[in-house]
């Protein structure tokens, strides 16, 4: 064996956001000819010595962080990046609204607001087709996601989730979808990016608001929060490669 073993990848199919009672498969992928795989749930004593974990029906206790590694001969690989498996539908859905409204002129501003009756301090906003959510810590039962200088790329279907930082892997059901329509522009398909844009967020300490824009690169903000990305899942309808904020 020459050189260190490469770390494996760990993905959740079809998604790492799993509604309660729905199936999900965690798959660890290393190089060909692996002798043994080990897939473990962090912060628990649960592990299994195989590459695939099949969950026929998602349960609360299965939510959490997973990672895997493999053995070749007497050598163990470095662990995979952690995969966060989230159970959704644990709590009632929040409501998602657009201010001033869901129809926006190109170049204008719009704020998406996710609101819940419960005391959740975390919110995640998803745009259909994007690989990652925009998460927003907020203390007042509501999260604001301003989108400044709207472009045609912001058109689409949005949903939000609410959850608690005390139980970060147990999420609400998704809000009803909100269709954001950007008027006054026409974009030809050839000018659209070939991949869904990555999300970039700037966090405002003063207002605890997340400003969301779109770019083809992911970079960290200048504040003490950083964006980390788990490996992108490929092929089949894989779940989002989730991006999140850590102090």
């Amino acid at each position: 064996q020459r050189g260190p073993l490469p770390k494996p990848s760990l993905q959740a199919l079809p998604s790492s956001l799993v509604p309660l009672e729905k199936p999900v498969t965690l798959r660890c992928q290393g190089p060909p000819g692996v002798d043994l795989y080990r897939l473990e749930k962090l912060s628990s004593s649960r592990y299994q010595d195989q590459a695939v974990l099949f969950i026929p029906a998602m349960k609360r206790h299965l939510a959490g962080r997973y990672r895997c590694s493999y053995q070749n001969g007497s050598l163990w690989s470095p662990p995979s990046d952690q995969l966060e498996l989230v159970a959704t539908g644990v709590f009632a859905k929040p409501s998602l609204s657009a201010q001033p409204g869901p129809a926006v002129s190109s170049g204008g501003d719009v704020t998406l607001q996710c609101q819940t009756r419960y005391g959740f301090d975390q919110f995640a906003l998803y745009k259909e087709g994007d690989p990652a959510p925009y998460k927003n810590p907020e203390r007042w039962y509501r999260a604001s996601f301003p989108i400044i200088t709207v472009t045609a790329a912001h058109s689409g279907t949005y949903r939000c989730y609410s959850f608690s930082s005390g139980d970060p892997y147990l999420w609400s059901a998704p809000s009803d979808p909100l269709e954001l329509m950007v008027t006054g522009t026409s974009v030809t398909p050839s000018r659209l990016p070939t991949e869904p844009p990555s999300s970039v967020a700037e966090f405002s300490e003063a207002t605890a608001e997340l400003t969301v824009s779109f770019t083809n690169k992911v970079f960290t903000t200048e504040t003490s929060r950083s964006i980390t990305t788990s490996p992108k899942e490929s092929d089949s309808p894989a779940g989002p490669a989730r991006q999140y904020y850590t102090k």
């Epitope: 079809p14 509604p19 729905k22 099949f54 029906a57 309808p237």
Partner: antibody, heavy 119, light 107 residues
């Protein structure tokens, strides 16, 4: 892989139906393997009833849940289904089938056993 | 519960023709869908699993497509042995439900 269903053939209303699925060519102790029961009234469509996984997790048709019990005998390669207090609406052909998690499908089926509920 | 709506309910076609049967799920089921063929007096037989994958021994004239909520089974160049009933079934959380079936008859 083969599966074969057996049952009483005829029952009277309010009796309990006991079905047995005997299989070979696979083991229900193998990770990701399950066995399910499906029924089909004559000339009608298919209806999933229940299934059981290698780890003894059991799932039931919501509408029939209170009347159904599925169990397994791994060492003898058998799965059982009981349906309490049968009625004429339970007259059907009953099939058992193997489930493999990878394909999420019923990949092998038995030949079926016919039940007639009549007074 | 997830409803599976299959169409058409019946279909007449001639040997050599191409036919398509569709199945619509009432919510997103990703690729958790299988197609079965059933001939008169026989048990169902798996054709396609995970929406697009042909089961072992199934002729290549059969193909499955779709994901999410819209699925289809296509049979190219129909053969005499292809006539019978076809069912779709979802596996995305219980209860697993079947479509109502499509009866494919010889014209």
């Amino acid at each position: 892989v083969t599966l074969k269903e057996s049952g009483p053939g005829i029952l009277q209303p309010s009796q309990t139906l006991s079905l047995t699925c005997s299989f070979s060519g696979f083991s229900l102790s193998t990770y990701g393997i399950g066995v399910g029961w499906i029924r089909q009234p004559s000339g009608k469509g298919l209806e999933w009833l229940a299934h059981i996984w290698w780890d003894d997790n059991k799932y039931y048709n919501t509408a029939l849940k209170s009347r159904l019990t599925i169990s397994k005998d791994t060492s003898n390669n058998q799965v059982f289904l009981k349906i309490a207090s049968v009625d004429t609406a339970d007259t059907a052909t009953y099939y058992c089938a193997r489930i493999h998690y990878y394909g999420s499908s019923l990949d092998y089926w038995g030949q079926g056993t016919t039940l007639t509920v009549s007074s | 519960d997830i409803q599976m709506t299959q169409s058409p309910a019946s279909l007449s076609a001639s040997v050599g023709e191409t036919v398509t049967i569709t199945c619509r799920a009432s919510e997103n089921i990703y690729s958790y869908l299988a197609w079965y063929q059933q001939k008169q007096g026989k048990s169902p037989h798996l054709l396609v699993y995970a929406a697009t994958n042909l089961a072992d021994g199934v002729p290549s004239r059969f193909s499955g497509s779709g994901s999410g909520t819209q699925f289809s089974l296509k049979i190219n160049s129909l053969q005499p042995e292809d006539f019978g009933s076809y069912y779709c079934q979802h596996f995305y959380g219980t209860p697993w439900t079947f479509g109502g079936g499509t009866k494919l008859e010889i014209k």
